[in-house]
Interface confidence: low
């Protein structure tokens, strides 16, 4: 006598709410004599899903005719799936006994999980900008997916990141799940044009993962480098002071010229030169008439970038001894 095998080919069945689910079960032998029943779960608390002989199961239909003499297909179809239907379904063979049927063999079970796609990942960056060499955190969130198994990866400019932590909630059984992941990214001076991407792969996406992105330009502040130079003009009694503000981001920058501590001009950066890496350069000029000067002049350029503390760069404009002599003559 061939030993009976209960074949449930699908380990996992993914079904969307409202769909029908077909739970397959075939047997390899007609013996021993007795019915095949369907249960959800195992142990004493298991729930009867279908019993051909008795009970009322309005949402369950059989795939084949169970009254046929040599029927070996005990597959069932459950209509209008709801979240409450999730669980593991077992087809179980019972042996005719007295006074009750005795469980003989169970199939390996088919887990029915609700199939729901994750929402498009939303990536959010830090609340405040940070400067290069500092670490910033980006958070990626996606929700509404089922089953619970999901893969999340982070990329920076296409290169996979490894410093991140991911949570899937809840831990217990649920209609749907959400994922939250936080990646830590060390900023580099050239990251103005960089992008971080969160990629979510799920069984419902058929190998086409969802992506969410964020620009590092929203998270980075590259402080300017400052250079001040002076050039005498042809006229001889004028000096052109050039103040170069280089490689800064974002654009908002204010420059104030001070002569011996007194404000003589305030400018807001407008005509900027953009560098290849996305940072900006700006040049400001100040023409100083030295013929009017009788003493050395301290010229200070004050740069305020993106609401940060002002940075000063000073230059002493030395008046020639001849001009100083003229000055002392004039006071006699």
């Amino acid at each position: 006598e061939e030993e009976l095998q209960m074949i449930q080919p699908e380990k996992l069945l993914l079904v969307a709410v409202g769909e029908s689910a077909t739970l397959n079960c075939t047997v390899t032998s007609l013996l021993p004599v007795g019915p095949v029943l369907w249960f959800r779960g195992v142990g004493p608390g298991r729930e009867l899903i279908y019993n051909q002989k008795e009970g009322h199961f309005p949402r369950v239909t059989t795939v084949s005719d169970l009254t046929k003499r040599n029927n070996m297909d005990f597959s069932i179809r459950i209509s209008s799936i709801t979240p409450a239907d999730a669980g593991t379904y077992y087809c179980v063979k019972f042996r005719k006994g007295s006074p009750e049927n005795v469980e003989f063999k169970s199939g390996p079970g088919t887990e029915m999980a609700l199939r729901a796609k994750p929402s498009a990942p939303v990536v959010s960056g830090p609340a405040a900008r940070a400067t290069p060499e500092h670490t910033v955190s980006f958070t990626c969130k996606s929700h509404g997916f089922s089953p619970r198994d999901i893969t999340l990866k982070w990329f920076k400019n296409g290169n996979e990141l490894s410093d991140f932590q991911t949570n899937v909630d809840p831990a217990g059984q649920s209609v749907s799940y959400s994922i939250r992941s936080t990646a830590r990214v060390v900023l580099a001076p050239w990251d103005v044009r960089s992008q971080v991407t969160c990629e979510v792969a799920h069984v419902t996406l058929q190998g086409d993962p969802l992506r969410g992105t964020a620009n590092l330009s929203e998270a980075i502040r590259v402080p300017p480098t400052l250079e001040v130079t002076q050039q005498p003009m042809r006229a001889g009694n004028q000096v052109n002071i050039t103040y170069q503000v280089r490689n800064f981001y974002p654009q908002n920058l204010q420059l104030t010229w001070l002569e011996n501590g007194n404000v003589c001009r305030t400018e807001t950066a407008s005509t900027l030169t953009e560098n290849k890496d996305g940072t900006y350069n700006w040049t400001s000029w100040l023409l100083v008439n030295t013929s009017d000067q009788r003493d050395d002049v301290v010229l200070t350029c004050q740069v305020k970038h993106d609401g940060q503390l002002a940075v000063n760069k000073s230059l002493v404009l030395e008046v020639s001894a001849h001009q100083k002599d003229q000055s002392s003559d004039a006071t006699h």
Partner: antibody, heavy 127, light 107 residues
């Protein structure tokens, strides 16, 4: 046999942190969710959160979010619960508990319940 | 969060009595409910899981029933060692929540 052994009683000052350990033995540590539950003197049971010992993923009750950190060390089959910014109302017995159902993540089938509990760790917060 | 409400909060009974404790969930939790027994100074002990499944090693005088929002723990014939505090707990969705407890005392 399956058991969870917790670290000893602690006395802490308000504002300090406490880290309680729970060492598992007698079963496959990474195959079952672990939970933390606390009980203030004369009060009921309060669920704090869970940890998946396989992945290290965690979930915390909103009340403890930002103050609690659950971690695990698979090499020693130990889970840890650290509670920071302690206040007097955190005085309680802290229990770790194992899930009855085998499997974590998608493999966790069936209803959850806590079948094995640690002996409890008394944490007293007093100035 | 799902609220779990137990009643009564305390009750007195005698050895041999049949005792029933009820637990109500603020929303449907299917059969994701467990019952625990706790004695003073001890950790809780699992009695029933999945609303009606008896945990291994627990005497058969304990039984659970119910589904959805209303659940019952029944002790068919009280024994001296059954005087303790009983808690229900849902594990349908996080945060898992407990009932406030029912203290069973000797009459």
């Amino acid at each position: 046999q399956v058991q969870l052994v917790q670290s000893g009683a602690e006395v802490k000052k308000p504002g300090a942190s406490v880290k309680v350990s729970c060492k598992a033995s007698g079963y496959t540590f990474t195959s079952y969710y672990m939970y933390w539950v606390r009980q203030a003197p004369g009060q009921g049971l309060e669920w704090m959160g869970w940890i998946n010992p396989n992945s290290g993923n965690t979930g915390y009750a909103q009340k403890f979010q930002g103050r609690v950190t659950m971690t695990r060390d698979t090499s020693t089959s130990t889970v840890y619960m650290e509670l920071s910014s302690l206040r007097s109302e955190d005085t309680a017995v802290y229990y770790c508990a194992k899930d009855r159902r085998r499997g974590v993540g998608l493999a966790a089938a069936g209803t959850s319940a806590f079948d094995i509990w640690g002996q409890g760790t008394m944490v007293t917060v007093s100035s | 969060d799902i609220q779990m409400t137990q009643s009564p909060s305390s009750l007195s009974a005698s050895v041999g009595d049949r005792v029933t404790i009820t637990c109500r969930a603020s929303q449907s939790i299917s059969n994701w409910l467990a019952w625990y027994q706790q004695k003073p100074g001890k950790a809780p002990k699992l009695l029933i899981y999945a609303a009606s499944s008896l945990q291994s090693g627990v005497p058969s005088r304990f039984s659970g029933s119910g589904s959805g929002t209303d659940f019952t723990l029944t002790i068919s014939s009280l024994q001296p060692e059954d005087f303790a505090t009983y808690y229900c707990q849902q594990s349908y969705s996080t945060p898992y929540t407990f009932g406030q407890g029912t203290k069973l005392e000797i009459k």
